[in-house]
Interface confidence: low
Amino acid sequence: LPAQVAFTPYAPEPGSTCRLREYYDQTAQMCCSKCSPGQHAKVFCTKTSDTVCDSCEDSTYTQLWNWVPECLSCGSRCSSDQVETQACTREQNRICTCRPGWYCALSKQEGCRLCAPLRKCRPGFGVARPGTETSDVVCKPCAPGTFSNTTSSTDICRPHQICNVVAIPGNASMDAVCTSTSPTRSMAPGAVHLPQPVSTRSQHTQPTPEPSTAPSTSFLLPMGPSPPAEGSTGDFALPVGLIVGVTALGLLIIGVVNCVIMTQVKKKPLCLQREAKVPHLPADKARGTQGPEQQHLLITAPSSSSSSLESSASALDRRAPTRNQPQAPGVEASGAGEARASTGSSDSSPGGHGTQVNVTCIVNVCSSSDHSSQCSSQASSTMGDTDSSPSESPKDEQVPFSKEECAFRSQLETPETLLGSTEEKPLPLGVPDAGMKPS
C-alpha cells in the first residue's frame, strides 16, 4: 500500500488498479477521476491535469460515475396510456409505466415501450387469471352453477344463489331468480373483484398463459358472433330437488292411474306422445342464430307415459362443438333450423367431487272427450349438488324436450342473450384465452 494517497491524475503501479470512481486514460496512461452522476467529461485528463466535468444539459442524464463526453438523452415523453413514474433529471432517465387497466405489451430496459388495455371478460365469462403489469387478463367460461353478468377485467365467475323456489334458473351470464323467499348461496362468493394491478415492475416477463381451468370442450372462434354464454342448468339444493322429483313421480302415478281408468271405461283416446327431435348440428351451425324449434310427433301407444333421467331443462349447448354420437332410436337428425339440447350433468374433476342429478318426468294425462287427445306434460327441473370445480364441462348429450320447456327456454334465451357481444380487445396483443383453443 502506498504511504500517501495519490491525487489524480497519477500513474498506477504496474499490475495495480485504479481506485473506485477513477478510470484509466489510455492516452495519458494515468488514473483519472470519473465524473459524478449528473455530469459528463467536458475535458479529458492529461498527464498533468485531471478530468474536467460539466453538468448535463436539460433532457439529458448520466446515472453512473462516468467519463463520457456527452450525457445520455432522456427517453421520449410518456404516451397517453402511460404514467410517468420517474421524471427525467440530470441523474436519471424518465420511466414510463402503464396506467391502471393497461398492461405492458412491450417493455424496454426500464419502464414500458408499449401499453395495451387489459382484456375485459364479457358476460358468461369470468377472470381465470388477473392481468399483471406485463401480462393480459385470461378469461374462462363460467362453469355450470356459476355466472358473470358484467363486462370486466376483474370480475370472476360467482356461484348462483340457491332458491327455495326458483323463478328463473341461472345460467352462465345470469344469476338465478328466486320467488319471494330469502335465497342462500351455494358457496361463499369470495371476492368478486380481483385487485387491479399497479404498474411498478419494469422488468418484462413474457406473459405465459397458465394451464386453463376452462372446460376442454370450449372453443373461441376468431370471427363471427362470440359463442353464447354457457348453459343454464340451475344449481339447486338436493332436498329441494328430491321434493320436486317425488312430486313429479306422484304426478306420473296419477297420470298412469288416470289412463287406466280411461281404459276401463273403454274409451279409446288417441293420445299423441309428443317428443321433440333433437338435431345433430355440426359445430358451425351450433354457433349461428337458432331458428324456431320444430316439433316432430311420434305416435305412441295410448296411455303411455315416459320418464327420462336425461335433463330437458338445460339450455342449448353454448360452447361445445358437436361430438359424433350415435342417435337414440327414434330420434333422428333433422333440419338445420333446430336447436340442440345438452344435459347439465358434470364430470367431477380431481379437485371437486360434485354430483348433478337431472330428472325429467313427462307425464301425459289423457282424457278422451270427443275422441281427441289432450296430453299435458309435466316437466321437472334439474336438480343437483354441484359442489364442483370450474374445470367441469357439460356433457354433450342429445335429449328430447317437451313443448313446455321450449316455451320456458324462449323466455330466458332471446336472440340477444344467445348472440353475446363480441369481446372487446382494441389491440391484438394479448395471448389467447387459455383453454379457448380454436377448433
Epitope: 498506477p12 504496474p14 499490475g15 495495480s16 488498479t17 485504479c18 477513477e22 478510470y23 484509466y24 486514460d25 489510455q26 496512461q29 488514473c31 459528463h40 446515472q63 453512473l64 462516468n66 467519463w67 463520457v68 463526453p69 456527452e70 445520455l72
Partner: nanobody, 122 residues
Framework: QVQLVESGGGLVQPGGSLRLSCAAS????????MGWYRQVPEKQRELVAE?????????AYADSVKGRFTISRDNAKNTVYLQMDSLKPEDTAVYYC??????????????WGQGTQVTVSS
C-alpha cells in the same frame, strides 16, 4: 444494438464460489468499461467490480468485495467474468452486467444485461 448476456448465477452455500460471465455482442464500436453491478430489493444498484480499458487493464472493486471477487476480461470474446469466492449471505442480490460503450461520435452509452440471481444461503 448491443446485447449483454449473463450466465453463472445460482444458489450457493456461504463460503462457496460462483463464476459469472457476461458476453457483449452486436455493434460494439469501442468499450470504455465493462463490469458488474448488483441490486437487492428496495436498494439502488451498486458497483461491484469494473474493468476499464488501458495498458495495465486497471480494475475497480467495491470495498465489500475486495480480496474475494476477481474481475477479468477476454478481449477477443468481448466477455467479462466475475469470480466470486468466499461468498457471504450479504452477497445475495441480482447481479447485472454493465458496459459503457463509445458510440461512433464518441458519446458514451450504458448497456445492461437482464440480471442473474445469486443467492448465498445455507
Amino acid at each position: 444494438q448491443v446485447q449483454l448476456v449473463e450466465s453463472g448465477g445460482g444458489l450457493v452455500q456461504p463460503g462457496g464460489s460462483l463464476r459469472l460471465s457476461c458476453a457483449a455482442s452486436g455493434s460494439i464500436f469501442s468499450i470504455y468499461a465493462m463490469g458488474w453491478y448488483r441490486q437487492v430489493p428496495e436498494k439502488q444498484r451498486e458497483l461491484v467490480a469494473e474493468i476499464t480499458e488501458g495498458v495495465n487493464t486497471p480494475y475497480a472493486y467495491a470495498d465489500s468485495v475486495k480480496g474475494r471477487f476477481t474481475i477479468s476480461r477476454d478481449n477477443a470474446k468481448n466477455t467479462v467474468y466475475l469470480q466470486m469466492d468466499s461468498l457471504k449471505p450479504e452477497d445475495t442480490a441480482v447481479y447485472y452486467c454493465h458496459a459503457l460503450l463509445a458510440g461512433p461520435g464518441g458519446g458514451g452509452y450504458d448497456y445492461w444485461g437482464q440480471g442473474t440471481q445469486v443467492t448465498v444461503s445455507s
